[in-house]
């Protein structure tokens, strides 16, 4: 039996700059029941606060609701582990909410096979930004990637589309079924997970409909 090992805050993420969660790895418990508490202060403030919500985001986590989240202040966060034999504290972690955004994937992915005047066929992929992001006001600047592959293929073909919410894919094989997904990344944050997969078959005998 021994004091607990040093915990480590290993991840903090925000879906929208309005709430965020931090998760920690507990370290060894020293063979004893061990309690964990997350405490934080904010830049320029002397006060220290305890985690407002240990439940919402699951075990070994702290959820900061809107009421506790500010993008104007840096959070200095530590996790303390305590058992009968002693205690141990993580290294402090400095968190700027602007830099931990991992948004939801883009929504309303639509796929349409189109044809140019020269009869060249292409796949027109369109989508919308995730619901929660206020892209119009510049609060978020979002970049996008799409990936596609034919059902038979092993590898995805990835296209970076910049800030565009549509993309044209040429040189696709007629008769093949293609799977498509999109993801997004805010200017200072992390890529979202890949969104829901959509599929479309490229017709063998595509003719332009009026």
């Amino acid at each position: 039996q021994s004091p607990p090992g040093k915990p480590e805050i290993h991840k903090c993420r925000s879906p929208d700059k309005e709430t965020f969660t931090c998760w920690w790895n507990p370290g060894s418990d020293g063979g004893l029941p061990t309690n964990y508490s997350l405490t934080y202060s904010k830049e320029g403030e002397k006060n220290t606060y305890e985690c407002p919500d240990y439940k919402t985001s699951g075990p070994n986590s702290c959820f900061f609701s809107k009421q506790y989240t500010s993008i104007w202040k840096i959070y200095i966060i530590t996790v303390n582990a305590t058992n009968e034999m002693g205690s141990s504290t993580s290294d402090p972690l400095y968190v700027d909410v602007t830099y931990i955004v991992e948004p939801e994937p883009p929504r309303n992915l639509t796929l349409e096979v189109k044809q140019l005047k020269d009869k060249k066929t292409y796949l027109w992929v369109k989508w919308l930004p995730p619901t929660i992001t206020d892209v119009k006001t510049g609060w978020f600047t979002m970049e996008y990637e799409i990936r596609l592959k034919s059902e038979e293929a092993d590898e995805w073909e990835i296209h970076f589309t910049g800030h565009q919410t549509q993309f044209k894919v040429f040189d696709l094989y007629p008769g093949q079924k293609y799977l498509v997904q999109t993801r997004c990344k805010p200017d200072h944050g992390y890529w979202s997970r890949w969104g829901q997969e959509k599929s479309i078959e490229i017709p063998n005998d595509f003719t332009l409909k009026d």
């Epitope: 480590e8 993008i71 104007w72 972690l93 400095y94 968190v95 700027d96 602007t98 992390y190």
Partner: antibody
């Protein structure tokens, strides 16, 4: 505690390439972005670029595009920077540096001195 | 790129004196989120740089309160109220509001 270990020095020939390493320990490697910074002898610091080890997303200073390539090996918690077509202008100390979830550098490696000489 | 200009280049001081270093940026350093990402680092001889001040005026963990930062827009200052021997080295200002992040040329604090 967080440590970033870099080899002390590399002597390389002009026109060749060199791959610098930065072995991270004391934290979850994939959770924090890794930056690289150049310092020429007696001069200031230049930010080269950054890599997100969780998905290898990179962002380069335009000045170093084509010169530096950032990669990671998550199995060994090591970040790499390859410098190509070396000239005397590339002789410098190169640091890897980690931020927290912020845009400054909280932890620095000791730096690798690269000397380009025939 | 944002150019960071530090003055003076060299600052000879006596131990116990106050020291002041200026840093001027070629563009305003207010980020779209309202924060000003101007930081100060100290590099002691033979060592890697270490963070002293983040976001203009916030002392990093373990940094003595004799260090203070101030400023806004394009003009920033680092002050050391009573210089100690361990403060000697090269001080760099740095901005991370605009990509690429850039550094000042450095100010060498040395004994008079």
């Amino acid at each position: 505690q967080v440590q970033l270990q870099q080899p002390g020095a590399e002597l390389v020939r002009p026109g060749t390439s060199v791959k610098l390493s930065c072995k991270a320990s004391g934290y979850t490697f994939t959770s924090f972005w890794m930056h690289w910074v150049k310092q020429r002898p007696g001069q200031g610091l230049e930010w080269i670029g950054v890599i997100d080890p969780s998905d290898t997303y990179t962002n380069y200073n335009q000045k170093f595009k084509g010169k530096a390539t950032l990669t990671v090996d998550t199995s060994s918690s090591t970040a790499y920077m390859q410098l190509s077509s070396l000239t005397s202008e590339d002789s410098a100390v190169y640091y890897c540096a980690r931020g927290d979830y912020s845009n400054w550098f909280t932890y620095w490696g000791q730096g690798t001195l690269v000397t380009v000489s025939a | 790129d944002v150019v960071m200009t530090q003055t003076p280049l060299s600052l000879p001081v006596s131990l116990g004196d106050q020291a002041s270093i200026s840093c001027r940026s070629s563009q305003r350093l207010v980020h779209s989120n309202g924060n000003t990402y101007l930081h100060w680092y100290l590099q002691k001889p033979g060592q890697s740089p270490k963070l002293l001040i983040y976001k203009v005026s916030n002392r990093f963990s373990g940094v003595p309160d004799r260090f203070s930062g101030s400023g806004s827009g394009t003009d920033f200052t680092l002050k050391i109220s009573r210089v100690e021997a361990e403060d000697l080295g090269v001080y760099f200002c740095s901005q991370s509001t605009h990509v690429p992040w850039t550094f000042g040329g450095g100010t060498k604090l040395e004994i008079k």
